[in-house]
Interface confidence: low
């Protein structure tokens, strides 16, 4: 993959940008699309062949304070008879999101962005079989 | 999480709520964790509700690359490797926070943005609607 040869120069910083101290950035935590809602199919965590439960984690020094994590209920998957089939595996599906962490150091408060790995749900997979020689 | 006790002599500044605008250290904690779902696992191929990953790119956003899942089938893959339409492949969606440049193109000025991403797919029993 080569850099294409088209007439466009390096990105230049606009003059209208707010001044920011070195080593930091200005972050507005008034969220764009704050009221957007997830339109997932109903109760998929219970109807899935790899069902999961939700746990809410709470941290007042994190923004957002509430982060929901999923945990797979079974090692195997649920078959058509409603029984656990251990020839298949329930595995977590994960996604990264950003949070803002508030840190107290003496009387000063600082803010740090942090990537958090959220388990979103589970899926049923065929296991990888390792053959021992 | 752990609440860090404050020095009682400190002025009470935004104790409960976060201020609307904050100055944040440029280094993101856990920034270099590998977030390419194609590299981190092959669940998207091995799942009974397999999905394809589509690259969504926006240079005005961090992260600039987000992978969107699209279920390959309406049904799920059965033990014989065929699509079983008695079951449904459905996307698992998640709201995530990203950074949006504000004003546009500025190097160190951002606003949090909530976006909805499909992370993967799962196989579910369909909801059957009986017609009276």
């Amino acid at each position: 993959r080569k850099i294409p040869k088209v007439g466009h120069t390096f990105f230049q910083k606009p003059e209208s940008c707010p001044p920011v101290p070195g080593g930091s950035m200005k972050l507005d935590i008034g969220i764009i699309n704050e009221n957007q809602r997830v339109s997932m199919s109903r109760n998929i965590e219970s109807r899935s062949t790899s069902p999961w439960n939700y746990t809410v984690t709470w941290d007042p020094n994190r923004y957002p304070s509430e982060v929901v994590q999923a945990q797979c209920r079974n090692l195997g998957c649920i078959n058509a008879q409603g029984k656990e089939d251990i020839s298949m595996n329930s595995v977590p599906i994960q996604q990264e999101t950003l949070v803002v962490r508030r840190k107290h150091q003496g009387c000063s408060v600082s803010f740090q962005l942090e990537k958090v790995l959220v388990t979103v749900g589970c899926t049923c997979v065929t296991p990888v079989i390792h053959h021992v020689q | 999480g752990i609440t860090i006790p404050r020095n009682p002599g400190c002025p009470n500044s935004e104790d409960k709520n976060f201020p609307r605008t904050v100055m944040v250290n440029l280094n993101i904690h856990n920034r270099n964790t590998n977030t390419n779902p194609k590299r981190s696992s092959d669940y998207y191929n091995r799942s009974t509700s397999p999905w394809n990953l589509h690259r969504n790119e926006d240079p005005e956003r961090y992260p600039s690359v987000i992978w969107e899942a699209k279920c390959r089938h309406l049904g799920c893959i059965n033990a014989d490797g065929n699509v079983d339409y008695h079951m449904n492949s459905v996307p698992i969606q998640q709201e995530i926070l990203v950074l949006r440049r504000e004003p546009p193109h500025c190097p160190n000025s951002f606003r949090l943005e909530k976006i909805l991403v499909s992370v993967g797919c799962t196989c579910v029993t369909p909801i059957v609607h009986h017609v009276a």
Partner: nanobody, 119 residues
């Protein structure tokens, strides 16, 4: 890319990457390297609109990434080179604000220049 070559441990090299342009406003430029039999790893990255560069822990204090907007050129000054720095070095460009040292964040790649450090 240019500027690669063979050097003794403790020596220096300066890599250059001349870019002709982009299909969209490129925000990140980075240097990556790949040693034989190893995965490609990020070395250093810079946001072309300003701000602090990022470095892999293994090169901090020894390598410096810089840019010359007038010449549309990216540089990597490599000092105190070690045998473990031996690799093919690639220049890369892509979008994104933080310019992380993760290769799939970068869309455009150079052909690479070989750096060999002998003890």
């Amino acid at each position: 890319e240019s500027g690669g070559g063979s050097v003794q441990a403790g020596g220096s090299l300066r890599l250059s990457c001349a870019a002709s342009g982009w299909t969209f406003s490129t925000l990140c430029m980075g240097w990556f390297r790949q040693a034989p039999g190893k995965e490609r790893e990020g070395v250093a990255a810079i946001y072309t609109g300003g701000g602090s560069p990022y470095y892999a822990d293994s090169v901090k204090g020894r390598f410096t990434i810089s840019q010359d907007n007038a010449k549309n050129t990216l540089y990597l000054q490599m000092n105190s080179l070690k045998p473990e720095d031996t690799a093919m070095y690639y220049c890369a460009a892509g979008g994104g604000g933080y310019c992380p040292l993760i290769d799939y964040e970068y869309n455009y790649w150079g052909q690479g220049t070989q750096v060999t450090v002998s003890s």
